[in-house]
């Protein structure tokens, strides 16, 4: 059987300050069940950049529509990048799980580069 | 053209045994998680179980008497139904999961059903 | 347990008549609502997902509104195959998926 991955085509991306980032990230399966996050860096100490269903990300956009159905394709663009942003990003999927998500599986992770603005 | 197409149904004595298929077509059967929801006659509709890839969900009137499954070479979900009850008496239905956004599943395409009768 | 609560529980309509149901959540369920028509005799059939986006083939009679804990199904002019019975359903939380416990449509 084929089990669900996740693909994060880019290994980098360099991007200049002030302008926006899009990060890619698509799956190849809707199971098994559960939601699926953007973190920055790896271990105990990422943060989190986007969950759709819980907290505020304003500078976080989706690529795909949230109420596409079926949807495979988890992309995020960030806006107003800034040297801060810069790290390794990672799309991950979580398996559902009764009180909390267990995570599943991860992306490879794309690193973000800032470039300064242009004068 | 989606197809969910329920067997197995039928009268059973409370504390025996029943399992439950579902044929489905029309779709990328081994990518979709797929339930079963049940209607006892003149009420209204009850979830019981769903299955992703070989993660299972139950609901508490079921759990540990019911086993939901999937082959996914044959496209078709099962439902092992043990130690039935009066109270199990239903048309249980098949349902194809949709999902929206990120996260969130619910019922787009539902089978005519099975009736399941629990009496002695 | 999410409760899903439908109301009026039977609403004998005339065709052509303007049809307003509704469907409160015990806690904020986000805009995470399906809507589903059921004939007698029928399987369950989708209208509505995320509180108010119409399944593929749906008239534009139908339309649904709402988030949080309050959901409003509305179908704009009553047509004679739109009798039947009406659920809600939440999938912001679960297991378990929970339903509403249906609205009556039926001929006044």
């Known amino acids: 059987e084929d089990e669900l991955q996740v693909i994060q085509p880019e290994k980098s991306v360099s991007v200049a300050a002030g302008e926006s980032a899009t990060l890619r990230c698509a799956m190849t399966s809707l199971i098994p069940v559960g939601p699926i996050m953007w973190f920055r860096g790896a271990g105990a100490g990422r943060e989190l950049i986007y969950n759709q269903k819980e907290g505020h990300f304003p500078r976080v956009t989706t690529v795909s529509e949230l109420t596409k159905r079926n949807n495979l394709d988890f992309s995020i663009s960030i806006s107003n990048i800034t040297p801060a942003d810069a790290g390794t990003y990672y799309c991950v999927k979580f398996r559902k799980g009764s009180p909390d998500d267990v995570e599943f599986k991860s992306g490879a992770g794309t690193e973000l580069s800032v470039r300064a603005k242009p004068s | 053209e989606v197809q969910l197409v329920e067997s197995g149904g039928g009268v059973v004595q409370p504390g025996g045994s029943l399992r439950l298929s579902c044929a489905a077509s029309g779709f990328s059967f081994s990518i979709y998680a797929v339930s079963w929801v049940r209607q006892a006659p003149g009420k209204g509709l009850e979830w019981v179980s769903t299955?992703?890839?070989?993660?299972?969900y139950y609901a508490d009137s079921v759990k540990g008497r019911f086993t939901i499954s999937r082959d996914n070479s044959k496209n078709t979900l099962y439902l092992q139904m043990n130690s039935l009850r009066a109270e199990d008496t239903a048309v249980y239905y098949c349902?194809?999961?949709?999902?929206?956004?990120?996260?969130?599943?619910?019922?787009?395409?539902w089978g005519q059903g099975t009736l399941v009768t629990v009496s002695s | 347990e999410i409760v899903l609560t439908q109301s009026p529980a039977t609403l004998s309509v005339s065709p052509g008549e303007r049809v307003t149901l509704s469907c409160r959540a015990s806690?904020?369920?986000?805009?995470?609502i399906a809507w589903y028509q059921q004939k007698p005799g029928q399987a369950p059939r989708l209208l509505i997902y995320?509180?108010?986006s119409r399944d593929t083939g749906i008239p534009a009679r139908f339309s649904g509104s709402g988030s949080g804990t309050d959901f409003t199904l509305t179908i704009s002019s009553l047509q004679s195959e739109d009798f039947g019975v009406y659920y809600c359903?939440?999938?912001?939380?679960?297991?378990?998926?929970?339903f509403g416990g249906g609205t009556k449509v039926e001929i006044k």
């Open positions: 349902a194809k999961d949709s999902t929206v956004g990120w996260s969130g599943d619910f019922f787009d395409y």
């Open positions: 806690q904020n369920v986000r805009s995470d």
């Open positions: 995320a509180a108010s």
């Open positions: 359903q939440q999938y912001y939380d679960w297991p378990p998926f929970t």
């Open positions: 299955i992703g890839a070989d993660d299972t």
